[in-house]
Interface confidence: medium
């Protein structure tokens, strides 16, 4: 005789009575009404489970709570069921025995029969776990149901000192969703909160969770598929604040069906955006466009921002959304990268992209810009990365497509190719009217447009000039005069520690900034504008330094230990982290500070020159690195502005020393024997390079590197060029993570030191 | 001026080991990488072995790699290049050779300086 | 690794101008731009004449120049000169801290 193996089957879910109706002691599970109607309701459900089938293997049930409406119970029951037949009793199979017996004509005297009209429409069966009834319990003393009404904004209080879990039970009308708002109010917290499509917490059913209070997100949105939520609060230290601030809507369901005819332009047309966005989709989510394209010269583009698609087996669910593009299945992720999916155009009907939620678990809102362009030609002078659909630089000397493509099949690398021969010459002497191809084609063309490439400037009419790095060199080369606008940057002052570095004079590096926390120097930083300055990203990685409210910056500083007529100081209004930075692999280390009021530009304050997106940096060129950080590895900051010169290097030699940690936007400079380099507290101060014309031109921000000065590892920068884009896009006011808000949590400053 | 010496050079049957030495004198030693480039009879250069300044990277041509051992002295001035498992084909002149610009970061793979040479002769 | 790619022999009468080709592949001379032109005279040691594809060291007449298209390097002699008979190699860095020869060409300057 052997005994039959059961395993414990957990479901949850809700009925509706129709003959009885919600009343506010309902809704408390303390009250003498609670926990007698419960104790009713949990009977009828034990005698429904009981006079089916499914009665042999019933072991327990429970009542937890009731909601508004026709009275709606919510309940779980297990069932102990035999191994052989788990499978076959799945939530819709369970609901289908209850459905029958509660539209049955037998004669049974049971109360879901007699005292209770039980709506079998109205029935919900999910599938739970133990855990999830071990989670609700926990939660039973600090149970609150709400019911959320049309155009009500229900603030959701805070659990008390005594708990130390808390379960939210939101409903709303049927036809409307719940959308819940948490706001983080402290900046550093253990909370965990869970949201749940369902009444009660099962894991099945996650939406989300966050933990701790969140930089990422300081506020956050969150969609139930429908007029159920549950949330779920669970207090990580003893706290007499809450750390965050709840309130739910219940908001309608917003359609996302668009019919859409693009122009023949190849700029940005619009946007498509899951709804209510930014706001996290909802795991009902169904969104289908249809864009029509004006010729079949054109595909189209989409243009992600930190979400990127890609090829899933058919047998995997999309976990962070589905994509359905031309039959093509691909699947949604988030990453700290821009990415672009190219359609190319087979049909003149256009192109119908679906996209859906395929679980309960979501993520934030998705908006994507469509452009078109050109088929036969979709990179002009650029290369097609087909990895991530981006345009990026060709053979320019470093590796911008992951595979490494666009440095392949290069007849020259980071110089200029002879149209005669194809011999290869370095940029500088592009231009420089002195002849060095055969034919002189170096020299030719240099006072008119040419088609745009790698290191030809584009002017703002967005023509592009031959000659490299024309940017304020003294000479009009555009057209339109751009190339000497903005000008007023990049020349020294009154003159003319950083390891193994000498002393700064008065107003040798004006645009060098100190950016302190109460009077203690942190980080160094740049002047790029009268109300910008620029430092790294990595300076703000602690919670701690997260709020601009903390930093003070100075200008025209010489010494850290006191204060001379030359200096001025400022507080910080905005902060801006680059959304992409990662501080494991400190890409994108980039961060601007507005300033609280403009700066007046003297001798010893004024800014250093940003370099177009195609300046030429040339490996081997020397350029000069200033701040105050350590004069060796863990030693204090210095007291007077050092300065030191510093050799840039290639990036392959870079990415090899480094074993391929180097990133597109990271640049190396430094010496063979070390000695010469930034350290802890240069973070985010400026790599600058003075150009044949006098000025000095940004060309990256101290970031990282293995010790400070040591031999064989030189100094890592963030390469101003790589993220010129969006510094521009900032400053004019196009956004990028602002606020206080800051992305991720290294550093040389914090030198990223290891 | 500016001097490289090798000695250490000789004959040898296969299957034997030589040590050879290089002598630098008349610039900062240990500033630089420092190279082995060999010249058989008759034939052209190659590359036997390279060393930073500091011996924390080494490289080794294909032909050698598991037998030769580069190695330096900075306080003595003195480059080595321990030879094992020697092959009939590693008869040749060996030259030592610095690196261009010792100063700088990274190298430019450039001998500017070499010495004259001593000669390996492997044969039974 | 293997040998970059050089003509064995080259030649032209004094006064004009020759040129040596080097080719290697995509992973040295395509990929870095350290190319360097060494001349041998007989029973003498080698002496940098290029380096950087196309930088001279100082001493070397600028009757030497050096360039690259893809994976060939070039080296051009012009005005030709008795004393530029001579062996020439080239070599490349082919990355993982190697570098690599070419078989060499043997500059004849006739007449």
């Known amino acids: 005789y052997k005994a039959e193996v059961t395993v414990s089957q957990v479901y949850s879910g809700s009925l509706r009575v129709l003959n009885r109706h919600f009343s506010q002691d309902l809704g408390r599970r303390e009250s003498i009404a609670f926990r007698s109607e419960s104790a009713k309701a949990q009977k009828m459900l034990q005698e429904l489970v009981a006079s089916t089938r499914l009665g042999t293997y019933y072991n327990s049930s429970s009542v937890y709570s009731f909601g508004e409406g026709p009275l709606t119970c919510f309940f779980w029951f297990i069932l102990d069921i035999p191994e052989y037949q788990r499978l076959t009793l799945s939530p819709e199979v369970v609901r289908e025995l209850l459905v029958d017996e509660l539209l049955s004509n037998s004669s049974t005297l049971a109360s879901y029969k007699t005292e209770y009209e039980v709506d079998p429409e109205g029935l919900v069966i999910l599938e739970a776990s133990v855990n999830d009834i071990v989670v609700l319990n926990s939660t039973l003393g600090c149970y609150r149901y709400s019911y959320v009404n049309p155009g009500q904004v229900l603030p959701l209080k805070g659990p008390d000192q005594q708990t130390t879990s808390c379960l939210w039970h939101l409903q709303g009308p049927e036809d409307l969703m719940i959308k819940v708002r948490l706001e983080w109010t402290r900046v550093d917290c253990r909370d965990r909160v869970a949201m749940y499509d369902a009444a009660g917490p099962l894991e099945k059913r996650l939406i989300t969770s966050v933990y701790g209070c969140s930089r990422q997100e300081p506020v956050m949105e969150v969609l139930a598929s429908g007029s159920v939520m549950a949330v779920v609060w669970k207090k990580g230290m003893h706290s007499y604040y809450d750390p965050f601030l709840l309130s739910v809507k219940s908001v309608a369901f917003q359609d996302c069906q668009v019919n859409l005819t693009l122009e023949g332009r190849l700029d940005t047309q619009g946007f498509l955006r899951t709804p209510y966005y930014p706001s996290y989709y909802s795991p009902s989510t169904h969104c289908s466009w249809h864009l029509t394209v004006p010729s079949l010269d054109y595909g189209l583009a989409l243009w992600f921002d930190a979400y990127a698609l890609r090829r899933q087996k058919y047998n995997r669910l999309c976990t962070q959304g589905q994509w359905m593009i031309q039959n093509r299945r691909l699947c949604g992720f988030r990453t700290l990268q821009p990415y672009a999916e190219r359609i190319p155009m087979v049909a003149s009907d256009g192109v119908t992209i679906n996209f859906t939620s395929q679980i309960s678990l979501t993520g934030p809102g998705v908006q994507v810009y469509y452009s078109l362009y050109n088929q036969s030609d979709p990179c002009p002078g650029e290369f097609l990365c087909s990895v991530n659909g981006l345009c990026v630089p060709a053979c320019d000397g470093i590796k911008d497509c992951p595979n490494g493509l666009d440095e392949r099949n290069c007849v020259c690398r980071a110089m200029f190719q002879c149209q005669e021969d194809s011999t290869c010459i370095s940029l500088p002497r592009v231009c420089d009217r002195q002849p060095d191809c055969l034919n002189g084609s170096d020299e030719e063309q240099c006072q008119e447009g040419v088609p745009c490439g790698t290191f030809t400037f584009q002017c703002e009419d967005r023509s592009c000039v031959k000659k490299p790095n024309p940017e304020c060199d003294g000479q009009s080369d555009c057209r339109d005069g751009s190339d000497e606008q903005h000008c007023d940057c990049g020349l020294q002052g009154l003159s003319s520690r950083i390891v193994g570095g000498t002393v700064s004079s008065e107003g040798e590096w004006p645009w060098q900034a100190s950016l302190q926390i109460r009077g203690r120097h942190i980080c160094g930083g740049a002047l790029i504008a009268d109300r910008w300055v620029i430092t790294a990203a990595h300076c703000f990685q602690e919670d701690s330094m997260a709020s601009p409210k903390l930093w003070t910056v100075f200008l025209g500083k010489m010494r850290q230990n006191s204060r001379w007529p030359g200096e001025v100081s400022f507080k910080v209004s905005r902060l801006f982290l680059h959304p992409y930075h990662e501080e494991d692999s400190h890409d994108y280390d980039v961060a601007l500070l507005q300033l609280d009021h403009p700066v007046v530009y003297s001798a010893t304050v004024r800014p250093v020159c940003l370099p177009a997106r195609s300046h030429f940096f040339e490996p081997g060129q020397h350029c000069w690195i200033t701040g105050w950080g350590a004069q060796r590895e863990g030693g204090p900051v210095s007291n007077t502005l050092q300065k030191v010169d510093v050799q840039l290097v290639p990036q392959d030699l870079c990415s090899e020393a480094y074993r391929y940690q180097v990133s597109p936007r990271m640049l190396c400079a430094g010496y063979r024997k070390g000695k010469k380099d930034a350290c802890q507290g240069d973070s985010g101060g400026p790599l600058v390079c003075r150009e044949p014309s006098g000025r000095w031109f940004l060309a990256g921000l101290v970031s990282w590197g293995l010790g400070c000065g040591r031999p064989n590892f030189f100094g890592v920068y963030t390469r101003v060029t790589r993220v010129i884009n969006w510094i521009q896009q900032v400053l004019t006011g196009g956004g990028g993570s602002g606020g206080g808000g800051s992305h991720h949590h290294h550093h040389h400053g914090s030198h990223h030191h290891h | 001026e500016v001097q490289l010496v090798e000695s250490g050079g000789g004959l040898v049957q296969p299957g034997r080991s030589l040590r050879l030495s290089c002598a630098a004198s008349?610039?900062?030693?240990?500033?630089?990488?420092m190279y082995w480039v060999r010249q058989g009879p008759g034939k052209g250069l190659e590359w036997v072995s390279g060393?930073?300044?500091?011996?924390?990277?080494?490289g080794y041509a294909d032909a050698v790699k598991g037998r030769f051992t580069i190695s330096r002295d900075n306080a003595k001035n003195v480059l080595y290049l321990q030879m094992n498992s020697l092959r009939p084909e590693d008869t040749a002149l060996y030259y030592c050779?610095?690196?261009?610009?010792?100063?700088?970061?990274?190298?430019?793979?450039?001998?500017?300086?070499w010495g004259q040479g001593t000669t390996v002769t492997v044969s039974p | 690794q293997s040998a970059l790619t050089q003509p064995p022999s080259a030649s032209g009468s004094p006064g004009q101008s020759v040129t040596i080709s080097c080719t290697g592949t995509?992973?040295?001379?395509?990929?870095?731009?350290?190319v360097s032109w060494y001349q041998q005279h007989p029973d003498k040691a080698p002496k940098v004449m290029i380096y950087?594809?196309?930088k001279r060291p100082s001493g070397v007449p600028d009757r030497f120049s050096g360039s690259k298209s893809g994976n060939t390097a070039s080296l051009t002699v012009s005005g030709l000169q008795a004393e530029d008979e001579a062996d020439y190699y080239c070599?490349?860095?082919?990355?993982?801290?190697?570098?690599?020869f070419g078989g060499g060409t043997k500059l004849t300057v006739l007449g």
């Open positions: 050779a610095r690196e261009k610009d010792g100063d700088f970061y990274y190298n430019y793979f450039v001998m500017d300086v």
């Open positions: 008349g610039f900062t030693f240990d500033d630089h990488v």
């Open positions: 060393i930073s300044w500091n011996s924390d990277t080494i």
């Open positions: 995509s992973s040295d001379v395509g990929f870095y731009n350290f």
């Open positions: 950087e594809v196309s």
């Open positions: 070599s490349s860095y082919a990355g993982s801290n190697k570098v690599v």
